[in-house]
Interface confidence: low
């Protein structure tokens, strides 16, 4: 049996850096939406009520605890009418798989904050990107967040050659050694080992030797 | 210099819930540190139970987790240990531990440098 | 999980002489999160070693730590009467945090 008409299907969580929008098919006829999402306390409670879009912003919701495991479903009315129900005495509704920000939110491309070069080492610092994850009024971090579970890998290579060399941090920052008077190139990625999904960023964009963020002091 | 004090009841009535709270005194909960709680048993071993960052992020030793509740009052600067249903195999000494990350030559180190004294939990009706 | 086995359960040295402690990781640990602690009777652990070789703040340069891998050792070059005491390694890189069940130096 085929998916009812005006049922979602194919509930997917597109989420990084726990910015997290809850995308499904089709696009409706006929019919609106209204999403629910389970909170800690197994209660549904209602967001992007009678929308004609298939997406939804969750974010406000799962940033409340991110280590909660989160499950929401996607319910479909008639147009004009959102007291409609199914055969059953239900709207139609489809669950989304479930959702654990912490360990499945996708690590955002890092940003390459400055690089500075004294005598043979360079010390280069990536961008602590403020995610959406509030305590007491304040934005977290993704260190706030993730803490010693997040490690950046530096990928660093001369300009003038193609060999890359790898380090890597469990701060913002790498301290290498490099070869005097010689300019190199970095890239950086995030990377979470514990995870089983999800685990790297995509590289940052490549920042070289000789370029604005860097700084030369002998 | 950041000291820790454990407090909470020194005895538990079987299938009841434990409580202990750690306070931390000397410096901020909030400084990028890890807190855990770790146990040993009369005579025994170091068992680590679980940790918690001041974020909220929480780790539990899996043979613990279904019982462990860790949290964090960054107001106070105290966090807490909640173990359920206890037995008499929860009698320990209970410790709470600072998990310090130390940077080093582009590396991190963790240990736990600062320890309380323990408090003594007996599970006993 | 990492299982932690030291050896042996117990030293018996005389003040003066060489202790010698291993402990032996079911998998291999990253050093940076090795450490090794010391326990005295009715006392909380403290402290020596961490990053299986740097010895923490105030720790007598008697005590020292090496190893990588699966094989840690700690080693006291010269007995003093305050190390007769239980030490402990653990490793913090991996959940569920791991101690070894120590081993414990005591008097001749």
């Known amino acids: 049996a085929g998916t009812p008409p005006g049922k979602a299907f194919n509930l997917t969580w597109i989420s990084t850096d726990f910015k997290t929008i809850l995308e499904w098919q089709p696009k409706p006829t006929n019919y609106t939406y209204t999403v629910q999402i389970s909170d800690r306390s197994r209660n549904w409670k209602y967001k992007c009520t009678g929308t004609t879009d298939t997406e939804c912003d969750l974010t406000d919701e799962i940033v409340k605890d991110v280590n909660w495991t989160y499950e929401a479903r996607v319910l479909s009315y008639p147009a004009g009418n959102v007291e409609s129900t199914g055969s059953a005495g239900e709207p139609l509704y489809e669950n989304s798989p479930e959702f654990t920000p912490y360990l499945e939110t996708n690590l955002g491309q890092p940003t390459i904050q400055s690089f500075e070069q004294v005598g043979t080492k360079v010390n280069v610092t990536v961008e602590d990107e403020r995610t959406l994850v509030r305590r007491n009024n304040t934005f977290l971090s993704l260190r706030d967040v993730f803490g010693k579970d997040l490690i950046y890998t530096l990928y660093y290579w001369k300009s003038s050659s193609s060999g890359k060399k790898t380090a890597k941090t469990n701060t913002n920052e790498f301290l290498i050694d490099v070869d005097k008077g010689e300019n190199y190139c970095f890239s950086v990625q995030a990377v979470i080992p514990s995870r089983t999904v999800n685990r790297k960023s995509t590289d940052s964009p490549v920042e070289c030797m000789g370029q604005e963020k860097g700084e030369f002091r002998e | 210099q950041v000291q820790l004090q454990e407090s909470g009841p020194g005895l538990v009535k079987p299938s009841q819930t434990l409580s202990l709270t750690c306070t931390v005194s000397?410096?901020?909960?909030?400084?990028?540190?890890?807190w855990s709680w770790i146990r040993q048993h009369p005579g025994k071993g170091l068992e680590w139970i679980g940790e918690i960052y001041y974020s909220g992020s929480t780790r539990y030793n899996p043979s613990l987790k279904s019982r462990v509740t860790i949290s964090v009052d960054t107001s106070k600067n105290q966090f807490s240990l909640k173990l359920s249903s206890v037995t008499a195999a929860d009698t320990a000494v209970y410790y709470c531990?600072?998990?310090?990350?130390?940077?080093?030559?582009?590396?991190?180190?963790?240990?736990?440098?600062?320890w309380g004294k323990g408090t003594t939990v007996t599970v006993s009706s | 999980e990492i299982v932690l086995t030291q050896s042996p359960g117990t030293l018996s040295l005389s003040p003066g002489e060489r202790a010698t402690l291993s402990c032996r990781a079911s998998q291999s640990v990253s050093s940076s999160y090795l450490a090794w602690y010391q326990q005295k009777p009715g006392q909380a652990p403290r402290l020596l070693i961490y990053g299986a070789s740097s010895r923490a703040t105030g720790i007598p340069d008697r005590f020292s730590g090496s190893g990588s891998g699966t094989d840690f050792t700690l080693t006291i070059s010269r007995l003093e009467p305050e190390d007769f005491a239980v030490y402990y390694c653990q490793q913090v890189g991996v959940v569920p945090y791991t101690f070894g069940g120590g081993t414990k130096v005591e008097i001749k």
């Open positions: 531990a600072r998990d310090t990350p130390y940077y080093y030559d582009g590396g991190y180190y963790y240990y736990m440098d600062v």
């Open positions: 000397g410096g901020s909960i909030s400084s990028g540190q890890y």
